[in-house]
């Protein structure tokens, strides 16, 4: 068993916070712009950070007619903050050839958020392995 690290694990903290943010966005799904968005799926381990960057670049935004616009924009700002660096060396990641964002299919905001949550879970699991 690994014990909790004494030094804050900023990446793990951030990934977990992001899961909470995605959960909140799912509550406000009906207030999101219905435009289709690039949503990576079946991401290989060494391409997780690049896939996450694709989610960050996607133009997820509140709809013009919806309520909670300010709150949603705050959540999206949180989502777009840079991830802290990995503690371990990431040579392997740089050698990997990852698909560019536009190669992933476009999905509704609902499925976009589902896939993003799935990726975050995968990144947490990978990070803890």
């Amino acid at each position: 068993h690994k014990s909790s690290p004494q030094r804050p694990d900023h990446l793990l903290i951030r990934l977990r916070h992001l899961m909470d943010i995605v959960e909140q966005l799912k509550i406000y799904e009906n207030d999101l712009d219905p435009e289709l968005l690039t949503a990576p799926q079946d991401v290989k381990g060494q391409c997780e950070h690049e896939a996450f960057a694709c989610f960050q670049k996607a133009k997820l935004k509140p709809s013009n007619t919806g309520n909670n616009k300010t709150f949603i924009n705050d959540l999206l700002a949180q989502l777009r903050r840079r991830l802290p660096a990995k503690r371990t060396g990431n040579k392997q990641r740089h050698m990997a050839k990852c698909p560019s964002c536009d190669l992933y299919e476009k999905k509704t905001p609902k499925e976009f958020l589902e896939r993003l949550k799935w990726l975050l879970q995968k990144m947490i699991h990978q990070h803890l392995s």
């Epitope: 068993h1 909790s4 804050p8 900023h10 977990r16 916070h17 705050d74 959540l75």
Partner: antibody
Framework: QVQLVQSGAEVKKPGASVKVSCKAS????????MHWVRQAPGQGLEWMGL????????IYNQKFKGRVTMTRDTSTSTVYMELSSLRSEDTAVYYC??????????WGQGTLVTVSS | DIQMTQSPSSLSASVGDRVTITCRAS??????LNWYQQKPGKAPKLLIY???RLHSGVPSRFSGSGSGTDFTLTISSLQPEDFATYYC????????FGGGTKVEIK
């Protein structure tokens, strides 16, 4: 070492508000978000919500939405939980707990709030 | 909301016994489960996080297992200081605690 020190016990009348504080030390305050959990006498634990200590972003349990407000003061490394429109069922021990990052890894000593007319 | 059901709600055991507490989630929560110990008049303490990882300073007689909806906390050899109430808690979607299991002296 990590310490969360909460304010003292409170007695309030129904309809009033209470504000509980939780002062953090022994770590960088803004690195960790904070949860609030309550426990009615002889009952289990109930999650109330959490606050992002670096960005005043909050997530509340729907049950308390509209009645609970969580805030923070980075200059004193303190988080606050205010509960309004108190009723007798709100009599409980209120705990702050550090979100660290997969669990509530350190807890305050608890603050007993008694709601009685 | 995800419901967490703990069983049994209480149990009596002796020092040296092997004790098992189970926790069931109303939907799949992967490995997003923690266990806490609480003694009367005290704040809860984290024992195990992410299903099976021991929090720092927790004795190795405590272990956790499971995945999906069914989880177990095991105390391999009960010690006098282990008589307490144990709570599971999911953190897959928001946070929910189980109802607790009180471990009493037989």
């Amino acid at each position: 070492q990590v310490q969360l020190v909460q304010s003292g016990a409170e007695v309030k009348k129904p309809g009033a508000s209470v504000k509980v504080s939780c002062k953090a030390s022994g770590y960088t305050f803004t690195d960790y978000w904070m949860h609030w959990v309550r426990q009615a006498p002889g009952q289990g634990l109930e999650w109330m919500g959490l606050i992002d200590t670096s960005d005043v972003y909050t997530i509340y349990n729907q049950k308390f939405k509209g009645r609970v407000t969580m805030t923070r003061d980075t200059s004193t490394s303190t988080v606050y939980m205010e509960l309004s429109s108190l009723r007798s069922e709100d009599t409980a021990v209120y705990y702050c707990a550090r979100y660290g990052p997969l669990a509530m890894d350190y807890w305050g000593q608890g603050t007993l709030v008694t709601v009685s007319s | 909301d995800i419901q967490m059901t703990q069983s049994p709600s209480s149990l009596s055991a002796s020092v040296g016994d092997r004790v098992t507490i189970t926790c069931r989630a109303s939907q799949d929560i992967s490995n997003y489960l923690n266990w806490y110990q609480q003694k009367p008049g005290k704040a809860p303490k984290l024992l195990i996080y992410y299903t099976s990882r021991l929090h720092s300073g927790v004795p190795s007689r405590f272990s956790g297992s499971g995945s999906g909806t069914d989880f177990t906390l095991t105390i391999s050899s009960l010690q006098p200081e282990d008589f307490a109430t144990y709570y599971c808690q999911q953190f897959h979607t928001l946070r929910t605690f189980g109802g607790g299991t009180k471990v009493e002296i037989k």
